[in-house]
């Protein structure tokens, strides 16, 4: 059975969050997708969305957020560059399917951004345009104004039987669902 999971990413200011959300290709390939933040006690707030209909591997940049929808792979890539401490929070990808409720994708992302230079070469990504060389794109259709009234529930604790993977750039505590993320120029 599919489990609703929440992955925790710990990053420093200036670093980049680079994640993906997968979806059922046959159902949702050209549907509009969005990146939302869920603040405690509030309804999800949409920060960025793809075009409508969503274009294949066409980057859409909204401020420091870059969305890329790989239709042919059923993947939405989300990058948040030049992270700030105030970016910390719980995020999710959703698929808009009006008039129905947005469809939430796996996994939710718990982002924790802390102050201080990481000490890793290439981690101080201050200029989005220089880093990604992506021409700024505005969405033709604005993100829908409605937000999902779905209540936010904490994901159940996950198994701790993970083995370590070769991500070594951020110090881990012994919490198994913290993901260490590399930083790039």
């Amino acid at each position: 059975a599919t489990k609703l999971t929440e992955e925790k990413y710990e990053l420093k200011e200036g670093q980049t969050l680079d994640v993906k959300c997968d979806y059922t290709l046959e159902k949702f390939a050209s549907s509009q997708k969005a990146w939302q933040i869920i603040r405690d006690g509030e309804m999800p707030k949409t920060l960025a969305c793809t075009e409508r209909p969503s274009k294949n591997s066409h980057p859409v940049q909204v401020g420091r957020i870059i969305l890329e929808d790989y239709h042919d792979h059923g993947l939405l890539r989300v990058r948040m560059v030049n992270l700030q401490v105030e970016d910390s929070g719980l995020y999710q990808c959703v698929i808009y399917q009006p008039p129905k409720e947005p469809h939430m994708l796996f996994d939710r992302i718990r982002l924790v951004v802390t102050k201080g230079f990481s000490g890793t070469p290439g981690s101080n990504e201050n200029s989005t345009q220089n880093v990604y060389k992506i021409p700024p794109t505005t969405t033709k259709a604005l993100c829908p104004l409605y937000t999902s009234p779905r209540t936010v529930t904490q994901a159940p604790p996950k198994s701790t039987a993970d083995v370590s993977t070769p991500d070594s750039e951020i110090n881990l505590t012994n919490v198994t669902d913290i993901i260490r993320v590399p930083v790039f120029n």
């Epitope: 599919t2 992955e7 993906k20 997968d22 990058r79 198994s159 039987a161 993977t165 790039f184």
Partner: antibody
């Protein structure tokens, strides 16, 4: 022990299908993507596609679209790759490989099966 | 699709030599590059991830460098067990592609 164990070699006729299995052990199966990579004799590596064992969603490269199906059985920690309408040029060793966390854009393959040789011959 | 071009295609060297293999991407891939080693009849083995990070358990004589379009895998002092084929692989976008491989042979 952290490992991926693949099913045995197969000989198929052109037009037939083959289903290769990949059993994961020693780690949480649903936390990491499973990728499929093939290698024709004496040739290089070719990525076929990926699957998220938690959601069951998958994607493949254009040349395999419509011919490849990636599935899984989470209760027994097995991923499957089925390739249909086989032709002689599909003769290759098929590898399953563990990717990064399902939510991460980390496409490195840190754990591999030993490979399954699929021979397509009339 | 991004093309990955490795050079040389094959290389003869002796135990103790310093060896360099290069990989060139057809467009900027930042540091989204991994290196693998494959011995005959065996599955590939991850050596370097994210251009320069050594995979756990891989000897320190292996190192990776580069960013953008040009990348290098260096073996500082060749050992007998290092004779194999080496592949680079990018993941800057999809589809993922590998280089054609560099075969390292004993001189």
């Amino acid at each position: 022990q952290v490992q991926l164990v693949q099913s045995g070699a197969e000989v198929k006729k052109p037009g037939a299908s083959v289903k290769v299995s990949c059993k994961a052990s020693g780690y949480t199966f649903t936390r990491y993507d499973i990728n499929w990579v093939r290698q024709a004799t004496g040739q290089g590596l070719e990525w076929m596609g990926w699957m998220n064992p938690n959601s069951g969603n998958s994607g493949s490269v254009q040349k395999f679209r419509g011919r490849v199906t990636m599935t899984r059985d989470t209760s027994i920690h097995i991923a499957y790759m089925e390739l249909s309408s086989l032709r002689s040029e599909d003769t290759a060793v098929y590898y399953c490989a563990r990717g990064g966390y399902t939510s991460s854009w980390r496409w490195y393959f840190d754990l591999w099966g030993r490979g399954t040789l699929v021979t397509v011959s009339s | 699709d991004i093309q990955m071009t490795q050079s040389p295609s094959s290389l003869s060297a002796s135990v103790g030599d310093r060896v360099t293999i290069t990989c060139q991407a057809s467009q900027d891939i930042r540091k989204h590059l991994n290196w693998y080693q494959q011995k005959p009849g065996k599955a590939p083995k991850l050596l370097i991830y994210d251009a320069a990070n050594l995979e756990t358990g891989v000897p320190s004589r292996f190192s990776g460098s580069g960013s953008g379009t040009d990348f290098t895998l260096t073996i500082s002092s060749l050992q007998p067990e290092d004779f194999a084929t080496y592949y680079c692989q990018h993941y800057a976008n999809l589809p993922i592609t590998f280089g054609q491989g560099t075969r390292l042979e004993i001189k």
